[in-house]
């Protein structure tokens, strides 16, 4: 985007440093933590966002520990390694040389090991189930209105192609949004379901990554939709490899 004296910012990612030093004085934005250039006309990858979040000053960071019931993402936040495209590297290691394999949304999918651990490929998360519970309302939301509002949200705010929102289920007060996107379905330029789900999660928690208007304003026929609990489940194209010890 073009730089102006007071308008060189990244509308899709607050966690950037922007300056008018691109070609022709264009505004160029780089993600905090990694210093990688980001495309401010679309969502930034979850890997770069996590890296930026971990690089932010501690007093400016809100650590959110996932619920114990979220069977997959229970390792909390970490400082990930991202590849040159901003995707998670298949193998992640911490400062103490403990390593593990992750899927395309950065969630651990193997037991932890040492530096000899091999992660042959980045396994794609092709199915995401977002489980929400909304605050009490006078009555249940109309299912078709709720469905339309949430589909509209993912299409407009996260630029996710409608075909990737597989279903919206509702049994008051539980809402479930199913996102599905196989490797073969994802074309160049398509937003990744993992990135969309992460932006949605941050929006729901009141930690919007967008500049400008700020927070989410979800309404169904004018009635505010306020979420009081969020759980996100991830299914990979290849099942995870955990030892039986962990399963017990």
């Amino acid at each position: 985007h073009t730089a102006a004296q007071d308008n060189c910012t990244c509308p899709t990612n607050k966690m950037t440093v922007c300056s008018p030093d691109g070609p022709g004085g264009r505004c160029q934005c780089r993600a905090l933590g990694s210093g990688m250039a980001v495309d401010c006309s679309t969502l930034t990858s979850k890997c770069l966002l996590l890296k930026a979040r971990m690089s932010a000053p501690k007093n400016a960071r809100t650590l959110v520990r996932p619920s114990e019931h979220a069977l997959v993402d229970n390792d909390g936040l970490y400082d990930p390694d991202c590849d040159p495209e901003g995707r998670f590297k298949a193998r992640q290691c911490n400062q103490t040389s403990v390593c593990w394999c992750v899927n395309s949304v950065g969630v651990r999918r193997t037991d932890k090991g040492d530096l000899s651990l091999r992660c042959d490929e980045l396994v794609r998360t092709h199915h995401i189930l977002i489980d929400l519970r909304h605050r009490p309302t006078a009555g249940a939301f109309n299912h078709s209105d709720l469905d339309a509002e949430l589909r509209r949200l993912f299409r407009e705010r996260y630029r996710l192609h409608p075909k990737f929102v597989a279903a919206v289920h509702y049994e008051q007060p539980t809402i479930q949004i199913e996102l599905r996107q196989n490797t073969s379905q994802k074309a160049a330029g398509d937003v990744d379901i993992g990135d969309a789900a992460y932006y949605f999660e941050r929006d729901i928690k009141g930690e919007s990554l967008f500049q400008g208007r700020g927070g989410l304003d979800l309404r169904v026929r004018g009635e505010p939709l306020q979420v009081e609990r969020t759980l996100i489940y991830y299914l990979d194209e290849i099942p995870p490899k955990f030892s039986m010890k962990r399963l017990t």
Epitope: T2, P11, E156, Q211, R213, G222
Partner: antibody
Framework: AVTLDESGGGLQTPGGALSLVCKAS????????MFWVRQAPGKGLEWVGV????????NYAPAVKGRATISRDNGQSTMRLQLNNLRAEDTGTYYC???????????????????WGHGTEVIVSS | ALALTQPSSVSANPGETVKITCSGS???YGWFQQKSPGSAPVTVI????KRPSDIPSRFSGSTSGSTGTLTITGVQADDEAVYFC????????FGAGTTLTVL
């Protein structure tokens, strides 16, 4: 069919105030952001301001900030522009417009306008 | 708000293809037709490439980087008008307008 009807224009005195109303029909008003855009005689289009669908958010162009208030009544499918401390440069045709992307991160923008009213002319002169 | 740059005028013969460009932002472009000063604008393209249902299919929109393009394929005499681009910055902006003359 989507219809947007503006009213309230006319001759206004400098320093005075005007109140324009946009009446919408043919669509679910509650589901859309709404804009005011104006055009001075012989000039281009100028974005005046926007209000989101619930009325909880407004944003204004620097030229009218501090003088303008946009409000809406979803029950009546109407939007209002109140502009105080009128100046000669406020002269022009004022259009009500509909925004097609209420959730977009840049939803304040002109790029999402998909429908326009016929306009109401405002002349600020002593 | 950022300045949007578009040519002041373009001309074409009936049946030819016309392209009008607008540059200045990577946001979403809209294109608005105004047939005479003071007449209401009509949206021919919004959100880069979406066309209102009552607009002929000869109007199309595209974007590349920070440039938006309005294409009129098989221009007609009735398309003669001023075309304004609008874009998606924190407060929406419009270009100065391009006058299309059909020869």
């Amino acid at each position: 069919a989507v219809t947007l009807d503006e009213s309230g224009g006319g001759l206004q005195t400098p320093g005075g105030a005007l109140s324009l109303v946009c009446k919408a029909s043919g669509f679910d008003f509650i589901d859309y952001d709404m804009f005011w855009v104006r055009q001075a005689p012989g000039k281009g289009l100028e974005w005046v301001g926007v209000i989101n669908r619930s009325g909880s958010y407004t944003n204004y162009a620097p030229a009218v900030k501090g003088r303008a208030t946009i409000s809406r009544d979803n029950g009546q499918s109407t939007m209002r522009l109140q502009l105080n401390n009128l100046r000669a440069e406020d002269t022009g045709t004022y259009y009500c417009a509909r925004g097609a992307c209420t959730h977009c991160w840049d939803a304040d923008s002109a790029g999402y306008i998909d429908a326009w009213g016929h306009g109401t002319e405002v002349i600020v002169s002593s | 708000a950022l300045a949007l740059t578009q040519p002041s005028s373009v001309s074409a013969n009936p049946g030819e293809t016309v392209k009008i460009t607008c540059s200045g932002s990577s946001g979403s472009y809209g294109w608005f037709q105004q047939k005479s000063p003071g007449s209401a604008p009509v949206t021919v393209i919004y959100w880069n490439d979406k066309r209102p249902s009552d607009i002929p299919s000869r109007f199309s929109g595209s974007t590349s980087g920070s440039t938006g393009t309005l294409t009129i394929t098989g221009v007609q005499a009735d398309d003669e008008a001023v075309y304004f681009c609008g874009n998606a910055d924190s407060s929406g902006t419009f270009g100065a307008g391009t006058t299309l003359t059909v020869l």
